[in-house]
């Protein structure tokens, strides 16, 4: 009966990881956190990357690592497949570098099973990576900064700070 106790799953209490296709997890997670609150605090550090919209699979991937899927049927947490990790890394690592940070060693894709099979269970992730991202994602570099108002041509989108800033000269009133 001890094993039955071990297998019990807990509801996911992290809001950004709710409604992602599964709703229970088991700690510790795949990066060693014992508590969901600790996992949640780490997850908040990825918000700029999620809002940037580098990969449609990023949020699901992160949740599958920090609150892996649990099932009463097997005693091990089910995390992401290596393929999803590589897909997310390929699209998001360049953006991470723009923020001045390296791809986390804790998300090293070689840690995850290459694919879901009877030997190693893992989650492949939702949908096709090539599907265009929803329009609600933030402005991408090169897009115009219409949100700042009438003088939008005086602004440029800066990746690192995730906002629109005045082009050189305008703040000094040279072109106004």
């Amino acid at each position: 009966f001890g094993d039955e106790e071990e297998r019990r799953c807990d509801p996911i209490r992290i809001s950004m990881c709710q409604n992602l296709g599964y709703n229970v997890t088991k700690m510790p997670n795949l990066v060693g956190h014992e508590l969901q609150t600790d996992a949640e605090l780490q997850l908040t550090t990825f918000t700029p990357l999620i809002q940037y919209g580098c990969s449609s699979q990023l949020q699901f991937f992160l949740c599958s690592v920090y609150v892996p899927m649990c099932t009463e049927k097997i005693n091990i947490p089910i995390g992401p497949c290596g393929g999803m990790c590589l897909s997310v890394k390929r699209r998001c690592e360049p953006v991470l570098k723009e923020f001045g940070f390296a791809w986390p060693e804790s998300l090293n894709c070689s840690k995850f099973p290459p694919q879901n099979d009877h030997n190693h269970m893992c989650m492949e992730g939702p949908g096709d990576e090539e599907v265009p991202l929803p329009h609600k994602t933030p402005i991408q570099p090169g897009e115009e900064c219409h949100s700042v108002g009438t003088n939008s041509d005086q602004y440029i989108w800066v990746k690192r700070s995730l906002n629109c800033v005045l082009k050189c000269g305008y703040d000094a009133g040279l072109y106004s």
Epitope: V31, G32, L49, E105, L162
Partner: antibody
Amino acid sequence: EVQLVESGGGLVQPGGSLRLSCAASGFTFTSYAMSWVRQAPGKGLEWVSAISGSGGSTYYAESVKGRFTISRDNSKNTLYLQMNSLRAEDTAVYYCARATGFGTVVFDYWGQGTLVTVSS
Amino acid sequence: DIQMTQSPSSLSASVGDRVTITCRASQSISSYLNWYQQKPGKAPKLLIYAASSLQSGVPSRFSGSGSGTDFTLTISSLQPEDFATYYCQQSYSTPLTFGGGTKVEIK
């Protein structure tokens, strides 16, 4: 340029209250978790509290739980720390800091700090 | 709570010296360890994150190593501007905790 400017510090009697503010600029405020870290005179750093970008999740050190409340107004790009039931041991310089790290919580930008003195 | 113990608490060194500061966690924290530099009257500055990654803009003479419970910050060749207090910080679990600091003084 990322800037964090704290205000609201001062002298307060034990048992009193104070509200600290931190005005943020130069980055998309809603994208980042924020934190308060304090430093008693001549002592080391002590983490006080943190809040997620949306404000939906908050975290506290045991020493301030139930007395301090962290909050943020994303429309004003401002972080707050409401401090109640203040004690002498709360005397410190309070720094607001941006929390980032992409999988490890680091404080990459800090304000200049505001001094809170609790004394009768 | 995870306790972070730094050693030494202070040290004297000369310009050009190789300086090593250690930080020990009371339990395993994997690589969730960051290093900061603080000068008198100033806010701390991030140097190293995730045990060994150099923060953007920080000189390469600073390096970090370690995993689990034992970590090291090394300054390969001490410069005049490096005289300061150095803190380690764990971000493995809340409450986030800092080491007591190591003051690097001029010999």
